[in-house]
């Protein structure tokens, strides 16, 4: 071995200066009576060395590196030989940092498994091999004096957490606890925990049941869940407190908290949550009034709240059939009671004789918001009730009597927009208790069947705006009836448009007399239909064989016209524009000549 | 210093009843897990039942279940063991005792014998 | 039912004496296993709990091991206060039975 490098540290703080020798032996000579010695770090050459020939022959070069930013390389001493650089030494220099204090030092006394756990931060990587040991003691007092040493705790490569066995824990006697860590360029020592391994204690959390129900116990209320938990057994003599979270499985909602509970609870029902849901629950337990760590969340449990009985209000209205004054069409419309008021799964409509104690007729039960019946003779009145699994709502009276009331007055309606209408009127005396508003298509669409309806509790209203099924360029019958105590009014109807479509045709224009320099046309009107904006004018056009254009005006129940003016027999192209408020048609073009000079009149 | 007094045993005859008390003293006693083991003359210790700290929960030994309640009175420092339809193989000394946190005995009661004879 | 066996359920030794007791739960128990002594006419006394946690007050010649289904109770040298009924007990869950002693006596 011809040469050998020698160097200050092999190991420095990342960025320090490094200083190395390479020393040739003389008998290596023969390469070169005087070789020059060059360094290499890594693949770099360096320059700087400083070449000396030394008392003994032997050849010497010395470098200083100013910075080492490499975390590791290797040095190395060379010669040129030949055309290739000869390594005669190597070494590896490695530069890094000493080891950060550890922080965040945190234990958990396991009571499955008997040990005590300890976690901690190593801090900053050091980029040398460092090693950690987690060194502990018992003490009698606050750890201010150190009884016997408990051994190291060396945990395995890479890990921020060791283990002590329980054969080296004193439960209810405190520890010291500290971490060292330790590379080539120091050691350094966390801050000393001083704990009881009971005091960090970490339980496993209870299980959560669902109350088997019992006959003698009342069912939860809506939006209520019964519930007990089976408390952890390796830690049922600990006192603790527990806390339960809870959120609907469905939507966004985040866990909502409830505690602190007892760990005993043989029963607990947890109310406050929205009927008919499935909520998930978990619950977690800490010791206490002693120190200890909170548990995990327990495995979750999936219960679902009872539904509450429909709290609505049943507005209704009815019909008789024409030719069958007994058989009944009944409608009625939900109207919650309160925010949350319940699932409606069906409506049952029933009837009870008279003289025939409890006993109730079903008369239909349907999920439909009508339903059609045969009305027994001796029947006046019926109960409609909205129901779920949890009950029925409050029966709603449907009293059948003759309209006995007076009638309101000044019905009329006018367009709002192209989907809503406004129907006003002049309320009766004595005020009513409201008013049913039926509407649905008029002729020739017109179909019972088809009606929608609203409730109008106010008795004092003059008006109603429809919103619902109005579609524009559709005529529409309204029905308004005014109810009273026990009777209601006579009906009222009227037609209208959310919005009305130019009238569809003109009337055909048909020539009567002609002349030298006159015509009489005629026409028959379109027959008016129902509830259409009537006709608001005539318009006459007339162009002559020059492309000359005349026009007149003419009111709305002009059946004919006569032309003035003309020229002897020469062409002309006549058509009728009908025109209402919401816009004008065209007739078909009637073309016609005027008779020569020398010819006689046509009548 | 932690003290517990038993009292309330004597002779009663089979299918009667007694009630057995201990006072507890030196500890806060509503925190802690009280039970009571009995052991029958020239026998070993059998457990009877527990009492969790708030009441709550009270196991019981399958040879008296259905016969003995264990209840305490966290207002008066007293646990008590309500033995109905006694019988002869309840004959024992009856020791209260603490529970510790991992369910240790910690102290006991120097003990009070029933003796179930007719 | 947690059934605890110990053995020897008697045994003789001389003071100064290294005596061993052992105790088998009938399944794992992890480390709830406590030891208890008893002299005659007299209430029981903890010695070891959560299988080698010596109870304040008791001397260190006493001590615990093992986990799981397997404990010992170990007393480095008998002394002549030691001779007494030992028993131990489970305490991971009811019913919280305990062994049927084992008696030591002077040899």
């Known amino acids: 071995e011809c040469g050998h490098i020698s160097v200050s540290a092999p190991i420095v703080h990342l960025g320090d200066p490094i200083t190395a020798s390479c020393i040739i032996k003389q008998n290596c000579s023969h390469l070169d009576p005087e070789p020059q010695i060059l360094w290499r770090l890594g693949a770099e050459l360096q320059p700087g060395g400083r070449q000396q020939r030394l008392s003994d022959g032997t050849q010497e070069s010395i470098i200083t590196l100013p910075h080492l930013n490499h975390t590791q390389a290797f040095l190395s001493c060379c010669l040129n030989w030949g055309n290739s650089l000869q390594i005669l030494d190597q070494v590896e220099l490695r530069a890094g940092y000493p080891p950060a204090i550890p922080h965040n030092l945190s234990c958990l006394m396991n009571l499955t498994t008997s040990s005590l756990i300890c976690q901690w931060e190593p801090g900053p990587e050091t980029h040398l091999p460092t090693s950690f040991t987690l060194k502990s003691f018992k003490s009698r007092g606050n750890c201010q004096t150190q009884g016997d040493s408990i051994l190291d705790c060396v945990p395995k490569d890479g890990q921020s957490h060791c283990c002590i066995p329980r054969k080296h824990l004193l439960l209810y006697q405190n520890m010291g606890i500290w971490v060292q860590a330790e590379n080539a360029l120091g050691t350094s020592m966390s801050p000393q925990l001083c704990l009881d391994p009971m005091d960090v204690v970490k339980l496993e959390p209870p299980m959560l049941r669902t109350m088997d129900p019992s006959p003698e116990a009342a069912p939860p209320q809506a939006g209520c869940l019964q519930l007990c938990w089976e408390p952890w057994q390796p830690g049922l003599h600990i006192n603790q407190k527990c806390e339960l979270r809870h959120k609907p499985q469905r939507g966004e909602a985040s866990w909502a908290l409830v505690g602190p509970l007892p760990l005993e609870a043989l029963q607990y029902e947890l109310c406050g949550l929205l009927p008919a849901t499935a909520y998930t629950l978990q619950i977690r337990c800490i010791r206490w009034p002693l120190p200890g760590h909170w548990s995990d969340w327990s495995p979750s449990l999936e219960l679902r709240t009872t539904e509450r009985a429909p709290t609505v209000r049943l507005d209704t209205w009815w019909r008789q059939r024409q030719l069958d004054p007994r058989t009944v069409q009944l409608f009625w419309k939900p109207v919650p009671l309160e925010e949350d008021s319940g699932r409606i799964q069906g409506y049952v409509v029933s009837w009870r004789p008279s003289g025939q104690a409890g006993a109730i007729l079903p008369l239909c039960n349907t999920t439909e918001l009508s339903c059609t019946f045969h009305l027994p003779s001796e029947a006046q009145e019926v109960a409609l009730v909205a129901y779920n699994s949890a009950g029925t709502s409050r029966p709603t009276p449907v009293v059948f009597s003759e309209s006995r009331g007076p009638a309101l007055t000044r019905l009329h309606a006018m367009a709002r927009d192209p989907h809503s209408l406004w129907v006003g009127w002049e309320p009766p005396n004595p005020w009513p208790q409201g008013y049913v508003i039926e509407w649905g298509l008029g002729p020739p669409s017109a179909s019972n069947s088809n009606k929608t309806w609203r409730m109008e509790q106010n008795g004092r209203a003059t008006g109603f705006l429809l919103k619902e099924n109005i579609r524009p360029f559709q005529l529409y019958e309204i029905i308004v009836t005014p109810l009273y105590q026990d009777t209601m009014g006579p009906s009222q109807h009227v037609y209208a448009y959310s919005q009305e479509m130019a009238p569809s045709h003109a009337p055909e224009l048909h020539l009567k007399h002609i002349g030298k320099t006159w015509a009489q046309l005629e026409w028959v009107p379109e027959p008016p239909e129902l509830g259409k904006s009537p006709l608001t004018h005539y318009t006459i056009f007339w162009t002559n064989a020059q492309n000359q254009s005349f026009s007149a005006i003419l009111n709305a129940s002009s059946r004919g016209f006569v032309l003035h003016g003309l020229e002897p027999a020469s062409l002309y192209h006549i058509h009728l524009m009908a025109a209402s408020q919401a816009g004008a048609t065209n007739s078909t073009v009637l073309t016609l000549m005027t008779l020569t000079p020398e010819g006689s009149e046509l009548h | 210093e932690v003290q517990l007094l038993e009292s309330g045993g004597g002779l009663v005859q089979p299918g009667g009843s007694l009630r057995l008390s201990c006072a507890a003293s030196g500890f806060t006693f509503s925190l802690y897990w009280m039970g009571w083991v009995r052991q029958a003359p020239g026998k070993g210790l059998e457990w009877v039942s527990s009492?969790?700290?708030?009441?709550?929960?009270?196991p019981y030994a399958d040879s008296v279940k259905g016969r003995f309640t264990i209840s305490r009175d966290n207002s008066k420092n007293t646990l008590y063991l309500q033995m109905n339809s006694l019988r002869a193989e309840d004959t024992a000394v009856y020791y209260c005792a603490k529970l510790g946190e991992l369910g240790m005995m910690q102290s006991w009661g120097q003990g009070t014998l029933v003796t179930v004879s007719s | 039912d947690i059934q605890m066996t110990q053995s020897p359920s008697s045994l003789s030794a001389s003071v100064g004496d290294r005596v061993t007791i052992t105790c088998r739960a009938s399944q794992g128990i992890s480390s709830y296993l406590n030891w208890y002594q008893q002299k005659p006419g007299k209430a029981p006394k903890l010695l070891i709990y959560y299988a080698s946690n010596l109870q304040n007050g008791v001397p260190s010649r006493f001590s615990g091991s093992g986990s799981g289904t397997d404990f010992t109770l170990t007393i480095s040298s008998l002394q002549p206060e030691d001779f007494a009924t030992y028993y131990c007990q489970q305490s991971i869950e009811y019913p919280a039975h305990f062994g049927g002693g084992t008696k030591v006596e002077i040899k």
């Open positions: 009492i969790s700290s708030s009441g709550g929960v009270t």
